[in-house]
Interface confidence: low
């Protein structure tokens, strides 16, 4: 029996220091 | 040009604190973080800890972080490195440094400060 | 913490030869966070290679960095007279440590 696979879609925002401490950018989150 | 430029050396007393400043032109200061490094006469490079110039986040060595604070001033693109309790073994030059990142690396420390001397002595 | 340990701590090499400088950790560092700085006297740190292999603006191509997991290497292919100072390594995971430094002098 096959299981469901969920799928997440990745969220992107401009961020400072969510991806990475000394950066602002784009960070995306699953 | 991209620099960071350090105030002036400093003779201190045990047991004074110390503030040195760094000033930053040539990029947008608020994009990237400040480290703070210092070595000891005749030694190997020490970081000190770490300030994030668009949130003011802190990450301070284990070693130093009851005595350490570092701030930054966006409006005059500054960061500042403050150190209580002087000790003879603070003394030192300090530098700070630009942290840098570009997608998933750490690009290092690519921007330093000329450095400032710190000498602790009675 | 990672520990970095530098070998050796000093070399010692004529102008024109190649260096081979040793960097390794107490634990797994992922090469992305690896970098490498030169110290001429007097002056600060300068940046060479960052991400275990890029080489930071401005850098000769006689440096290459190399390694992952827990050892890293700087190569200087063929030493000019300016190469001959202090080295250090740096890793970033949960903070920054440096190296001890290699001293590469002439022989």
């Known amino acids: 029996r096959r299981r469901r696979r969920d799928t997440h879609f990745p969220i992107c925002i401009f961020c400072c220091g969510c991806c990475h401490r000394s950066k602002c950018g784009m960070c995306c989150k699953t | 040009q991209v620099q960071l430029v350090q105030s002036g050396d400093e003779v201190k007393k045990p047991g004074a604190s110390v503030k040195v400043s760094c000033k930053a032109s040539?990029?947008?200061?608020?994009?990237?973080?400040i480290s703070w490094v210092r070595q000891a006469p005749g030694q190997g490079l020490e970081w000190m800890g770490w300030?994030?110039?668009?949130?003011?986040?802190?990450d301070y060595a284990r070693n130093l972080q009851a005595r350490v604070t570092m701030t930054t001033d966006t409006s005059t693109s500054t960061a500042y490195m403050e150190l209580r309790s002087l000790r003879s073994d603070d003394t030192a030059v300090y530098y700070c440094?630009?942290?840098?990142?570009?997608?998933?690396?750490?690009?290092?420390?690519?921007?330093w400060g000329q450095g400032t001397t710190v000498t602790v002595s009675s | 913490e990672i520990v970095l340990t530098q070998s050796p701590g000093t070399l010692s090499l004529s102008p024109g030869e190649r260096a081979t400088l040793s960097c390794r950790a107490s634990?797994?560092?992922?090469?992305?966070?690896l970098a490498w700085y030169q110290q001429k006297p007097g002056q600060a740190p300068r940046l060479l290679i960052y991400?275990?292999?890029s080489r930071a603006t401005g850098i000769p191509d006689r440096f290459s960095g190399s390694g992952s997991g827990t050892d890293f290497t700087l190569i200087i292919s063929r030493l000019e007279p300016e190469d001959f100072v202090v080295y250090y390594c740096?890793?970033?995971?949960?903070?920054?440590?440096f190296g001890g430094g290699t001293k590469v002098e002439i022989k």
């Open positions: 440094a630009r942290e840098g990142w570009n997608d998933d690396y750490f690009c290092g420390l690519d921007v």
């Open positions: 040539g990029y947008t200061f608020i994009k990237y973080g």
């Open positions: 300030i994030g110039a668009f949130n003011g986040n802190t």
């Open positions: 634990q797994s560092v992922s090469s992305n966070y």
């Open positions: 991400g275990a292999s």
């Open positions: 740096q890793q970033y995971g949960s903070s920054l440590t």
